[in-house]
């Protein structure tokens, strides 16, 4: 997937340790975040979205399809 600039406004706080889910909202400065394809074991992790692997954290994260949100894109956005 290459490199993406991720900001707290769109992706929550950036966390550093392997295994951590980054779902907080602590403001951080813009940071360059590296992604790769998700390991095969996370094939079904993102319910309504695309999986990518956050290299710094060594965890999967989801890019949700329009109309969905949540860590796994499991929730429907009723206002969409």
């Amino acid at each position: 997937d290459g490199n993406t600039t991720r900001t707290p406004e769109t992706n929550g706080s950036l966390c550093g340790a392997p295994g951590e889910n980054c779902t907080g909202t602590t403001p951080r400065q813009k940071s360059k975040t590296h992604f790769s394809r998700c390991p095969k074991q996370y094939k079904h992790y993102c319910i309504h979205g695309r999986c990518r692997f956050v290299m710094d954290e060594q965890t999967p994260s989801c890019i949700c399809e329009k109309g969905y949100f949540g860590a796994r894109c499991e929730q429907v956005d009723l206002f969409y």
Epitope: C15, A17, S36, R37, Q58, A71, R72
Partner: antibody, heavy 116, light 106 residues
Framework: QVQLLESGGGLVQPGGSLRLSCAAS????????ISWVRQAPGKGLEWVSY????????NYADSVKGRFTISRDNSKNTLYLQMNSLRAEDTAVYYC?????????WGQGTLVTVSS | DIQMTQSPSSLSASVGDRVTITCRAS??????LGWYQQKPGKAPKLLIY???SLQSGVPSRFSGSGSGTDFTLTISSLQPEDFATYYC????????FGQGTKVEIK
Amino acid sequence: QVQLLESGGGLVQPGGSLRLSCAASGFTFSRYWISWVRQAPGKGLEWVSYIDSTGTFINYADSVKGRFTISRDNSKNTLYLQMNSLRAEDTAVYYCARGGSLFDYWGQGTLVTVSS
Amino acid sequence: DIQMTQSPSSLSASVGDRVTITCRASQGIISYLGWYQQKPGKAPKLLIYAASSLQSGVPSRFSGSGSGTDFTLTISSLQPEDFATYYCQQYDALNTFGQGTKVEIK
């Protein structure tokens, strides 16, 4: 500092059940994936199961699928492993470890012995 | 399932030696590989993740390399505290460990 403390191990007969617990402290438990990894006496490491931070995404090793159930209570900072239909080959030290893909902190382990 | 094969199973070395342990995956795992150190009666310790990234707090004499199916852990100058068993672990498909390599004192 990060601490993981397993409990609940012991001697159980084949076919029996046991529930392991792992109490976590020193980090925001609800933000991390957590796993169980086991090690039979004198043998290597075997990953058993993991659960994601919300408790909605779970995977198991084929060797325990259908017999073991992983769960977590984020309000209690505790991970669980319910082990049913235990076999002699389940005898091992069971570790809880922080992470789903990689394991950066481990508990000291709890010994489960399955024997008649 | 992806099988991880480590070699050698054991090795004898002296303090100051350069030690290399290899790990081969039965299919390509990109760089989804970690290395752990375990001492008798203790829990494993993560040394390397993503094949070559050094875990925080781990001495720089440890290094990892490789991608695809062939990976290497190198200890540039063996120290007394490094005598232990080392495991590789893949995390592309469901997590599996190698059988371990025991590093003993010569």
